[in-house]
């Protein structure tokens, strides 16, 4: 026996008229049934209507063995066709059918919107045998219904390779409006129009939208969902949200911040990573982008040496990486460096300026008055020179590099010697006789090796020749001298 034990909560007038076979209520119905072991009673809507012939999808039974009488066609009894309930309530519904006892192994499956419901669903099938027929009741329960439970449920029974299908039971879960589209945070240009969109659905429908800006309603009359709010422009940041109303109540969207694009904040923490004689590698931490992506940055370099002009060099670079190698700088010079970055609105102020220095460079001039002569008795070549007049930018002199190339009968060999800064002469051993020795000298500082002097050549005769005439650096513009001794 199936009974509907209790009714409570008022029905919601959602439909213009009664639907045949529909139950529009928040009823909680208790069902008294023989329960399978461990099964707890669930809320359900009981099929109290008497069964009536169903001609849609029926199984026509065969003649009995006696051949005397036909069995009636098999069909599911009609049940409630439409269940309307609120979110988070429990629901139970069922299908019932009487099957002649001649049929064995009947199974009932539940389907939702054309897909079989398998696995962890609360479906229970109970059998009530009688002399000629067995009443089968298949119950389906859902605890704490959600919108995703909305749909059309049917029972299917397979019998004699035929399929018997019940009438659909439509489950309509009603609740507060549910947002399918909420406004999004945006960064907008000052005093420029922009749109926000809000969309919410029931059931129940309709859903009406109110817009809220900084806690105040924007529209006095609600708009049907979906709603697009056109904001003519803002001068300062604002927070927008939308309220969605239906007969169940209201839902408020997330509040979204609409930011006004501005020039970026200045970069911070400009720091020096590496300095050479003519370049400085810097990095910086970008400031706040002003709600608009950085486009590029400008590295500003200002001469700050006491007698400098103060010339300003500006180097444009990409916004990332936040690093730049400043080139074309003077050696041993002081610079003030700042960084500014821009977005679509404009340039940031310049970062705090930092002081940076280049290191000493290589000498820019070669040693002067290079002379070379042969000291035959010692089998040496004697080299003399004058210290170049180097500026401090070239760094402190640490020594000299002497290149001597020996050429004889198609053979050429270059050797390098290093001598200390206090020297202004050097002796090198004769490497090859009957050969030409070409000597060049460069000054060396910590900053590097300077230019070599013009080559000075001296001929080294075979043993026995004695002549000590020197070779010396040519006058500017002259060809390289070759002194044969």
């Amino acid at each position: 026996a199936i009974t509907e034990a209790r009714e409570e909560a008022k029905p919601y007038p959602l439909f213009p008229g009664p639907l045949p076979g529909s139950l529009q209520t928040d009823h909680t119905s208790l069902l008294s049934l023989p329960h399978t072991s461990g099964y707890q009673p669930a809320l359900m809507f009981s099929p109290t209507q008497p069964g009536r012939p169903y001609t849609g999808n029926v199984a026509i039974p065969r003649v009995t063995s006696a051949g005397s009488k036909l069995l009636p066609p098999l069909a599911f009894k009609h049940t409630v066709g439409h269940i309307i309930l609120s979110e988070h309530k429990d629901v139970k519904f069922n299908c019932s059918i009487s099957v002649p006892n001649i049929y064995q192994d009947t199974t009932i499956s539940w389907w939702k919107d054309g897909k079989e419901l398998l696995g962890a669903h609360h479906a229970i099938t109970q059998f009530y045998p009688d002399d000629e027929v067995t009443a089968i009741i298949a119950s389906f329960s859902i605890t704490s219904v959600q919108r995703s439970d909305n749909g059309s449920y049917i029972c299917k029974m397979k019998i004699n390779n035929e399929e018997i299908v019940s009438d659909p039971i439509y489950i309509e879960v009603q609740g507060l409006p549910h947002f399918t589209k909420q406004p999004e945070s945006m960064n907008v240009t000052r005093n420029t129009a922009f749109n926000l969109t809000c969309q919410a659905v029931g059931p129940p429908e309709p859903v009406n939208i109110f817009w809220v800006q900084n806690s105040s309603r924007v529209n006095e009359q609600p708009e049907k969902s979906p709603s697009v709010l056109t904001v003519p422009g803002l001068t300062e940041m604002a927070v927008f949200s939308c309220e969605a109303h239906n007969d169940k109540g209201l839902t408020v969207s997330k509040g979204v911040q609409i930011n006004i694009k501005a020039i970026p904040s200045p970069p911070t923490e400009v720091s020096i990573h590496n300095s050479t004689a003519h370049s400085i590698l810097i990095s910086w931490v970008p400031g706040f982008d002003g709600y608009s992506p950085f486009r590029n940055c400008s590295v500003q370099v200002k001469e700050v040496d006491p007698l400098s002009n103060g010339s300003v060099m500006i180097f444009n670079t990409s916004a990332s990486p936040h690093m730049y190698q400043i080139k074309q700088l003077q050696a041993l010079a002081n610079y003030s460096i700042g960084v500014s970055c821009m977005n679509e609105i404009g340039w940031s102020a310049v970062s705090p300026w930092i002081l940076a220095s280049t290191t000493e460079g290589a000498p820019s001039v070669a040693p002067l008055n290079v002379t070379v002569f042969l000291n035959e008795s010692r089998d040496n070549v004697d080299i003399r020179w004058m210290k170049p007049l180097t500026k401090r930018q070239a760094g402190e002199l640490v020594g000299y590099r002497i290149s001597h190339v020996w050429q004889s009968a198609g053979i050429s060999k270059e050797l390098l010697e290093e001598v200390g800064q206090n020297n202004s002469r050097a002796q090198i051993s004769v490497q090859v006789h009957n050969a030409t020795c070409t000597v060049r000298i460069a000054a060396v500082t910590k900053g590097g090796v300077g230019p070599f002097s013009d080559p000075v050549k001296i001929f080294i005769p075979a043993h026995g020749w004695v002549d000590h005439a020197p070779s010396s650096t040519p006058a500017p513009g002259n060809a390289d001298p070759v002194l044969i001794i």
Epitope: Q300, D305, L307, N309, G310, S311, V312, V350
Partner: antibody, heavy 114, light 107 residues
């Protein structure tokens, strides 16, 4: 051509202040240092300080800190030196000079007298 | 602060003679020394800039030498138009400091 224009003279009372101007033309104002130099009558030259119009950054001679304040107005390409709490010791010709002192203004004679 | 000692305070030369003015700095300033000429009622005029570089338009009878702490301005073949006050200015470090000046006169 490069020019630095200064007013010829300013007469001020003791304890008052004066703002000496130096209007630049003929070059990119924001690209070079502007220096200020003091010369008392019949005396030598004293460096007061310098300012870079690009970022308005000044460097002062310690001796003139608190006495002179250097500023620039980029829109009019003008540098200013504000002298405060004037005494007879401040009576002098004040020159502005550009970059590495290759160009000079004609000088402003500031006379402090009751 | 780098101090600059300029000598002599005054110098009287005959026309055509060579005049020599010296500046000594208290710290090494490399080659960062400027030399100026100032005539009465006029601003100083830059003659020679750092690195002993003669400025454009300055007669070649003016020259300078020196490096580190010792610097010399030389005026060859003194002319009457060279009568003026001469100042050196060190640019090795801030604050910039001028020499006390040399008054060059004609005998």
């Amino acid at each position: 051509q490069v020019q630095l224009q200064q007013p010829g003279a300013e007469l001020v009372k003791p304890g008052a202040s004066v703002k000496v101007s130096c209007k630049a033309s003929g070059y990119t104002f924001t690209n070079y240092w502007i220096h200020w130099v003091k010369q008392r009558p019949g005396q030598g030259l004293e460096w007061i300080g310098r300012i870079h119009p690009f970022d308005s950054e000044p460097n002062y001679n310690q001796k003139f800190k608190g006495k002179a304040t250097l500023t620039v107005d980029k829109s009019s390409s003008t540098a200013y030196m504000h002298l405060t709490s004037l005494t007879s010791e401040d009576s002098a010709v004040y020159y502005c000079a550009l970059a590495s002192f290759a160009y000079w203004g004609q000088g402003t004679l500031v006379t402090v007298s009751a | 602060e780098t101090t600059v000692t300029q000598s002599p305070a005054s110098l009287s030369m005959a026309m055509g003679e060579k005049a020599t003015i010296r500046c000594i700095t208290s710290t090494d300033i490399d080659d960062k020394m400027n030399w100026y000429q100032q005539k009465p009622g006029k601003p100083p005029k830059l003659l020679i800039s750092a690195g002993n570089t003669l400025r454009p338009g300055v007669p070649s009878r003016f020259s300078s030498s020196g490096y580190g702490t010792d610097f010399v301005l030389t005026v060859e073949n003194m002319l009457s138009e060279d009568v003026a006050d001469y100042y050196c200015l060190q640019g090795g470090a801030l604050p910039l400091t001028f020499g006390s000046g040399t008054k060059l006169e004609i005998k």
